[in-house]
């Protein structure tokens, strides 16, 4: 079942998704789509990365984290009730059926009437799994899309991995609540 995340109308929503690049420069293409992850690709793509850049995005959707270090978490600016629903983060590992797919459920709550301290990110439930990718030798083919074979180790929760990481510090500094 999907992990659930919440945000209020008018806030920025944050949908976490992570992987570890096999090697510097060998980033894995990632797509984000609205709707559950289909068999291939992402449906209703809102943002896409390639081996180095964000190469497609639609307004209000962006990557605020260190996406070149594997933090491909999606920020949705100024959400409305219409932004509620399932989002797919797909790590497009080279090879047949190697992709890692994460379905994240975004629940948008109406804005509170009483003023409250602004929070940029509001997390609920657990973080999605973190991916560790390891390369087996250099990529020698002549296309940007060709990367080394990657062996994935899934890690059930991100929390322990983040104890002293930069992301943990970022979360602390942002004042985000982890429930």
């Amino acid at each position: 079942s999907e992990v659930e995340y919440r945000a209020e109308v008018g806030q920025n929503a944050y949908l976490p998704c992570f992987y570890t690049p096999a090697a510097p420069g060998n980033l894995v293409p990632v797509c984000w789509g609205k709707g559950a992850c289909p068999v291939f690709e992402c449906g209703n793509v809102v943002l896409r990365t390639d081996e180095r850049d964000v190469n497609y995005w639609t307004s209000r959707y962006w990557l605020n984290g260190d996406f070149r270090k594997g933090d491909v978490s999606l920020t949705i600016e100024n959400v409305t009730l219409a932004d509620s629903g399932i989002y797919c983060c797909r790590i497009q590992i080279p090879g047949i059926m190697n992709d890692e797919k994460f379905n994240l459920k975004l629940v948008i709550k109406p804005a509170k009437v009483t003023p409250a301290p602004t929070r940029q990110r509001d997390f609920t439930a657990a973080f999605p799994r973190m991916l560790t990718t390891r390369g087996h030798g250099p990529a020698e083919t002549q296309t940007l899309g060709s990367l080394p074979d990657i062996n994935l180790t899934q890690i059930s929760t991100l929390a322990n991995e983040l104890r002293d990481s930069r992301l943990a510090n970022d979360l602390r500094d942002s004042g985000a609540t982890i429930r």
Epitope: G25, E51, R52, D53, W62, N64, D66, E140, Q142
Partner: antibody
Framework: QVQLVQSGAEVKKPGASVKVSCKAS????????MDWVRQAPGQGLEWLGY????????SYNQKFKGRVTMTTDKSTSTAYMELRSLRSDDTAVYYC?????????????WGQGTTVTVSS | SIVMTQTPKFLPVSAGDRVTMTCKAS??????VAWYQQKPGQSPKLLIY???NRYTGVPDRFTGSGSGTDFTFTISSVQVEDLAVYFC?????????FGTGTKLEIK
């Protein structure tokens, strides 16, 4: 220490091609992207594209697509940028610049620049 | 492509002044902004990467800040050797684009 040494100045006629070289030393050539940036006289900086020497992957600025080709020779740790169908507004200093993973692909080292003059 | 609007174009300064220049991206670029210094006849030099990280060997009088669309570059106490043109650059998405530059000149 890291060095990027570019080829010498070129004078070309409109319609001709130019090929600028950039020899890298002091680091593992295949571990870093090589980008190319140009600067017209008295103007700002304009990105042409990049090549990843590890696998030859390239990405070009749409503005130059079809006119620019970037290649590398791993055996000599040299990157090349060829620009075809030259026009007078291609007159500029052309720089190679190393795109560093650890600096989020900003350019931590630059070549000294190659002046390309396009004139009839 | 993403437009980087850099202001001001010229900045008259005296030694010891604190100066600030800004760069505004036409859409969000996260923290993927770098600042470069270029002196006449020289190649650009990287000062700040990923919006706020000072590059190795860069004096701590140079600082960068910002995220999303608005970025600031500050020199806390201008030295004579800082007279140069400063460029911002986004490297979030290609084509990577630069600001038009801010030229520091003597008052």
């Amino acid at each position: 220490q890291v060095q990027l040494v570019q080829s010498g100045a070129e004078v070309k006629k409109p319609g001709a091609s130019v090929k600028v070289s950039c020899k890298a030393s002091g680091y593992t050539f295949t571990d870093y992207y090589m980008d190319w940036v140009r600067q017209a006289p008295g103007q700002g900086l304009e990105w042409l594209g990049y090549i990843y020497p590890n696998n030859g992957g390239t990405s070009y600025n749409q503005k130059f697509k079809g006119r620019v080709t970037m290649t590398t020779d791993k055996s000599t740790s040299t990157a090349y940028m060829e620009l075809r169908s030259l026009r007078s507004d291609d007159t500029a200093v052309y720089y190679c610049a190393r795109g560093g993973y650890y600096s989020y692909y900003s350019y931590d080292y630059w070549g000294q620049g190659t002046t390309v003059t396009v004139s009839s | 492509s993403i437009v980087m609007t850099q202001t001001p174009k010229f900045l008259p300064v005296s030694a010891g002044d604190r100066v600030t220049m800004t760069c505004k991206a036409s859409q969000s670029v996260g923290n993927n902004v770098a600042w470069y210094q270029q002196k006449p006849g020289q190649s650009p030099k990287l000062l700040i990467y990923y919006a706020s990280n000072r590059y190795t060997g860069v004096p701590d009088r140079f600082t960068g800040s910002g995220s999303g669309t608005d970025f600031t570059f500050t020199i806390s106490s201008v030295q004579v050797e800082d007279l140069a043109v400063y460029f911002c650059q986004q490297h979030y998405s290609s084509p990577y684009t630069f600001g038009t530059g801010t030229k520091l000149e003597i008052k």
